[in-house]
Interface confidence: medium
């Protein structure tokens, strides 16, 4: 009679995480008498997965009725597969005795587990940066298998090329992680921009996962200031406005100085929003010219988003001609932003 053979027909089996894996095993003879055991791995460190004779294996069920005397099918099903279950499984025939001794092993079936990557998480720099600066964004995704994965970066739908990606670990593992860093140059129009990290993997079957970062959380657009003198509103009164344009975020404090002395401080509240997401704001100061004997230097000083203050000044000329004072005429001087009050 021919010697018993242990046949594992599948060299490899690939299963999605969470599914059940069926590992096939048949023997060609009922002799010698003795149990079948399943192991993961070979050698002294091998792990017992199933013992036909004894033990409790809650995730393992036999495919056929292995308790029947004439049964020669010892295939098993392992439920709720995770990446940690990956490995080579051996169906081993034992000869009955005290103790049972190993008689013959199957060739082994390699179980690979397909696991989806986690949703990519994109994080930007800790501090805001201004236009023309280059900032770094990182993208991370974990827990996928097999190792082969594709990662792309986009800014507003346009693919980026300046990035570096690593998949860890380098060697064999039950699951893998990907880490990528992209460099993005900021522009003044980036308040509404998005940076997207896209991960594609065999388990996703054409539905890539995306992680997003809004550049509104990264960018700081400093304001431009313009100080102008409005037509005289009333006798001896001049209205000076400070236009604060194209700034982001909204956090802004403005201080008016008259000849270096603080006149008024206010916080931007009723701002107008531009199409590009930046803000405009206007503050005005009513100056009583008759209260000043000499020229007045008016300064609009703006502190934006905790940054060092920027300022713009305007010289208000107060003429020493009493007989003409209060005639409510404003003549423009050749100097920029200057007015002579007569």
């Amino acid at each position: 009679e021919e010697e018993l053979q242990v046949i594992q027909p599948d060299k490899s089996v690939s299963v999605a995480a969470g599914e059940s894996a069926i590992l096939h095993c048949t023997v060609t003879s009922l002799i010698p008498v003795g149990p079948i055991q399943w192991f993961r791995g070979a050698g002294p460190a091998r792990e017992l997965i199933y013992n036909q004779k004894e033990g409790h294996f809650p995730r393992v069920t036999t495919v056929s009725e292995s308790t029947k005397r004439e049964n020669m099918d010892f295939s098993i099903s392992i439920s709720n597969i995770t990446p940690a279950d990956a490995g080579t499984y051996y169906c081993v025939k034992f000869r009955k005795g005290s103790p049972d001794t190993e008689f013959k092993s199957g060739a082994g079936t390699e179980l690979s587990v397909r696991a989806k990557p986690s949703a990519p998480v994109v994080s930007g720099p800790a501090a805001r940066a201004t236009p023309q600066h280059t900032v770094s964004f990182t993208c991370e995704s974990h827990g996928f298998s097999p190792r082969d994965i594709t990662l792309k970066w986009f800014k507003n739908g346009n693919e980026l090329s300046d990035f570096q990606t690593n998949v860890d670990p380098v060697g064999e593992s039950v699951s893998y992680s990907i880490h990528s860093t992209a460099k993005v140059v900021l522009t003044r129009e980036d308040v509404h921009s998005q940076v997207i990290c896209e991960v594609a993997h065999v388990t996703l079957q054409g539905d890539p996962l995306r992680g997003t970062a809004n550049l509104s959380e990264t960018i700081r657009v400093p304001p431009t200031l313009e100080v102008t003198q409005q037509p005289v509103r009333a006798e001896n009164q001049v209205n000076v406005t400070c236009q604060v344009r194209k700034f982001y975020p909204q956090r802004l404090q403005l201080t008016w100085l008259e000849n270096g002395n603080v006149s008024r401080t206010e916080t931007a509240s009723t701002v107008t929003e531009n199409k590009d997401g930046t803000y405009n704001w206007m503050s005005w100061l009513l100056v009583n010219v008759s209260a000043h004997r000499d020229d007045v230097k008016l300064t609009c000083q703006v502190e934006h988003d905790g940054q060092p203050a920027v300022s713009k000044s305007h010289d208000l000329k107060v003429s020493a001609h009493p007989k003409e004072q209060g005639s409510n005429t404003a003549a423009e001087n050749t100097g920029s932003n200057e007015r002579n009050i007569y």
Partner: nanobody, 126 residues
């Protein structure tokens, strides 16, 4: 290996409609990106439409855009190709295929698809 079966082909007049179905004998088609391809006599096989596993991503070849619609019912594990305004040049054997390995959805290269059905004949003629 996924075993795909197409149905719904036949003879139709120009301007008519047909709906092709693709099912999997092992009921696993809901796990894979799926495409419809066609091959006319003497011509190379070409991609017609493809759909991602969830159905949220679809792609079409230019000649069928606006006339053909690919969809899927994952509860029934079936993928459909609704063909309207059919033209004589749509005459071909239509194949359903599953993409088991690609990262991105692609209809252009049939080499990305590694599980095929036997095909169903579509003839557009008056």
């Amino acid at each position: 290996q996924v075993q795909l079966v197409e149905s719904g082909g036949g003879l139709v007049q120009p301007g008519g409609s047909l709906r092709l179905s693709c099912a999997d004998s092992e009921f696993r088609l809901d796990e894979y990106a799926t495409g419809w391809f066609r091959q006319a006599p003497g011509k190379e096989r070409e991609g017609v439409a493809c759909i991602s596993r969830s159905g949220s991503n679809t792609k079409y070849t230019d000649s069928v855009k606006g006339r053909f619609t690919i969809s899927r019912d994952n509860a029934k594990k079936t993928v459909y190709l609704q063909m309207n305004s059919l033209k004589p040049e749509d005459t071909a054997v239509y194949y359903c295929a599953a993409d088991l390995t690609s990262h991105y959805l692609s209809c252009s290269s049939y080499t990305d698809y590694n599980s095929w059905g036997q095909g169903t004949q579509v003839t557009v003629s008056s």
